[in-house]
Amino acid sequence: DTEIKVNPPQDFEIVDPGYLGYLYLQWQPPLSLDHFKECTVEYELKYRNIGSETWKTIITKNLHYKDGFDLNKGIEAKIHTLLPWQCTNGSEVQSSWAETTYWISPQGIPETKVQDMDCVYYNWQYLLCSWKPGIGVLLDTNYNLFYWYEGLDHALQCVDYIKADGQNIGCRFPYLEASDYKDFYICVNGSSENKPIRSSYFTFQLQNIVKPLPPVYLTFTRESSCEIKLKWSIPLGPIPARCFDYEIEIREDDTTLVTATVENETYTLKTTNETRQLCFVVRSKVNIYCSDDGIWSEWSDKQCWEGEDLSKKTLLR
């Protein structure tokens, strides 16, 4: 009764198509699969960035897989062939592992790469990234930003740089069609007559770095003798009302400060007859239903009401 064996996949490699971190893992079927013609062979693929604690594991019948990686670090992957139990009249048979690695050979000392990279997707409309030059680099150093997301044919270079002292220190992006809810890859590299510059790679999703405009049209309405309803409107732009969380700061008579977080565009405040003045500001942020993270907007303009004038509906800016 001979033991059933299967070879690992052939020609296992990680291919970099130039998408700044989105890589192809590909392989060929193992040798000597003739005995298993009636069988659907599967492959178990494990991969990770070097230094990561955990492997991502995929089982597939395909000869390729694609995923995003952090190109600041190396990548390691391994794959083996799986013969399901139906093919072997018994238990599943696994080949030995085929292994491969990939990394971009660095150049430049780490200090030369850009510092404090910061990207904000303003009002879910305009992406702006800014950075500081690397430590110890001369003014002849220039940084260039490239970006890619699924839907673009190839990585694009920034065409509208923000400059300081002749150096690129940021990028204003053009309109980015169908670019949210997918990984957005950036590489900032550089050149200098003086010394080589280390490249930096960044990956994020645009909906997670949105900074909305502040809410507008703040108003007061007396609900009852001891309740005032605060209302505001969502700012102009593409973000739907269901995507907002709000933070309100209310000041009564220059003393009491109330802070509250709410999910819609109203807040009811209990007041006393003694309240002489009420002021509030609101800011907004994209909520957990629309993103995993976000940036608070600036505070709105302050809206104030002085008690005795409430019946006349006088609202003071």
Partner: antibody, heavy 116, light 108 residues
Framework: EVQLVESGGGLVQPGGSLRLSCAAS????????VHWVRQAPGKGLEWVGV???????DYNSALMSRFTISKDNAKNSLYLQMNSLRAEDTAVYYC??????????WGQGTLVTVSS | DIQMTQSPSSLSASVGDRVTITCTAS???????LHWYQQKPGKAPKLLIY???NLASGVPSRFSGSGSGTDFTLTISSLQPEDFATYYC?????????FGGGTKVEIK
Amino acid sequence: EVQLVESGGGLVQPGGSLRLSCAASGFSLTKYGVHWVRQAPGKGLEWVGVKWAGGSTDYNSALMSRFTISKDNAKNSLYLQMNSLRAEDTAVYYCARDHRDAMDYWGQGTLVTVSS
Amino acid sequence: DIQMTQSPSSLSASVGDRVTITCTASLSVSSTYLHWYQQKPGKAPKLLIYSTSNLASGVPSRFSGSGSGTDFTLTISSLQPEDFATYYCHQYHRSPLTFGGGTKVEIK
């Protein structure tokens, strides 16, 4: 197996020149950077410079004007050209492979003695 | 330049002792770029610990590293005869790359 072998050291007079070689095997200089590091007798380690896989170079600025690092990818070899040598350049010179921003393999070193 | 100051510069210890070597950087160094090397007389340095706390291939688990910012530590939990050597910390963060002055671990 990764190996680095330095050669070219010896006795040289002050003001003279010397060219050290580092023959690499088990990896390609087109994929890995290689550093030169020196150690004066009884002293600590001093970084001289690095030739990156892509061909660019970083130097210790204190030595930059007199020392030049080059490589020959076809021969998988790295070189350190040292000019205007001084007594204080007397040291064992090591080449070391760069891997993930550390020096993971070192050669056995070659001794350079600058003396009249 | 970032100065790397090791202490002590030498120490005498017995087999089985716990040994701690400290390395202080004159400027903050990312933990990713702080490494430790071991050098025995007449031999080349050997990478011992990379990125502050990761053991290089083949290094026994009695070696460990820790720290952040400007203060880093190498610890040998139970000194073995083959551990008598000189140890160097190294910063790979800023140019020029620099090493500590070394700590020589001798047999008591």
